[in-house]
Interface confidence: low
């Protein structure tokens, strides 16, 4: 319990601020799973790393905030951080 | 600021080897990937594949696989492409980049010739 | 691999003109990345996350699109446009590019 919220810390917080920007725009369209709301804008925009973590992980709960994490670090191209991220979380 | 400098430019003879290189600073190498495009004269760009320095994976485009390989080394902060076998056809500029933010160097002008 | 076929391959636009260049995708992807490249330099970004304009970009530059349908727009051509355009996918790997569109000025 708490692995995979770290693992999301762990990938947001080396997210440059320009990152952590484009982040939360894929965030605000990336298709979610049925029957999960989406973070509202507002707020989303506002919030650093660890904020979001929470945020990410009350909305999703840990398995599908870090897999949701995961896909849009790929989406961004960061195929190698969206990798370490989900091999942490599936230790 | 941020800076990728890449090597002069290579004259190489067909079926020989050449190792182009990428030396990164201003930043910690080991934070962000670097990857490689190639462009021939009047041409478009393609993607060669990346390498993260940290872990040393590497991430090839399957055209490139038996062409390119990828390497870094951390203690001088600095990327290395090796294209093997050379032919007329590897004659391009061979670009590094920053892999997150897009940095790029300013290329390396590769001829083949006999 | 995915391949993304841009269009026109090369066009002329005179100043104040609207101009749109076109990414088609062979396979769906979530967002588009777009390169300006001019004669005897490195590309530079352009449009990152199909939309946003890299620091710099004039707002006349756009970028829209979806899934496997994406464009780069200018609303006014400058003489300072004319280069040649880039789209790069990079939702899966390899990273392709577009073949690039030439973008001349009238």
């Known amino acids: 319990m708490g692995r995979a919220r770290d693992a999301i810390l762990d990938a947001l917080e080396n997210l440059t601020a320009e990152e952590l920007k484009k982040f939360k725009l894929k965030l605000l369209s990336v298709p979610l799973r049925e029957g999960y709301g989406r973070i509202p804008r507002g707020a989303l925009l506002s919030m650093d790393a660890l904020d979001l973590t929470d945020k990410l992980v009350s909305f999703y709960l840990e398995t599908y905030g870090a897999e949701l994490t995961a896909n849009v670090l790929r989406d961004m191209g960061l195929q190698e951080m969206a990798g370490q991220l989900q091999a942490a979380t599936h230790q | 600021q941020v800076q990728l400098q890449q090597s002069e430019a290579e004259l190489a003879r067909p079926g020989a080897s050449v190792k182009l290189s990428c030396k990164a600073s201003?930043?910690?190498?080991?934070?962000?990937?670097i990857f490689w495009v190639k462009q021939r004269t009047g041409q478009g760009l393609e993607w060669i594949g990346e390498i993260y320095p940290r872990s040393g994976n590497t991430y090839y485009n399957e055209n490139f696989r038996d062409k390119a390989t990828l390497t870094a080394d951390k203690s001088s902060s600095t990327a290395y492409m090796e294209l093997r076998s050379l032919t007329s056809e590897d004659s391009a500029v061979y670009f590094c980049a920053r892999q997150r933010d897009d940095y790029w160097g300013q290329g390396t002008t590769l001829t083949v010739s006999s | 691999q995915i391949v993304l076929t841009q269009s026109p391959a090369i066009m002329s636009a005179s100043p104040g003109e609207k101009v749109t260049i076109t990414c088609s995708v062979s396979?769906?992807?979530?967002?588009m990345y777009w390169f300006q490249q001019k004669p005897g330099t490195s590309p530079k970004v352009w449009i990152y996350?199909?939309?946003n304009l890299a620091s710099g970009v004039p707002a006349r530059f756009s970028g829209r699109g979806s899934g496997t349908s994406y464009s780069l727009t200018i609303s006014r051509m400058e003489a300072e446009d004319a280069a040649t355009y880039y789209c790069?996918?990079?939702?899966?790997?390899?990273?392709?590019f577009g073949s690039g569109t030439k973008l001349e000025i009238k």
């Open positions: 396979s769906s992807v979530s967002y």
């Open positions: 996350s199909t939309s």
């Open positions: 201003g930043y910690t190498f080991t934070s962000y990937g």
């Open positions: 790069q996918q990079r939702s899966s790997y390899p990273f392709t």
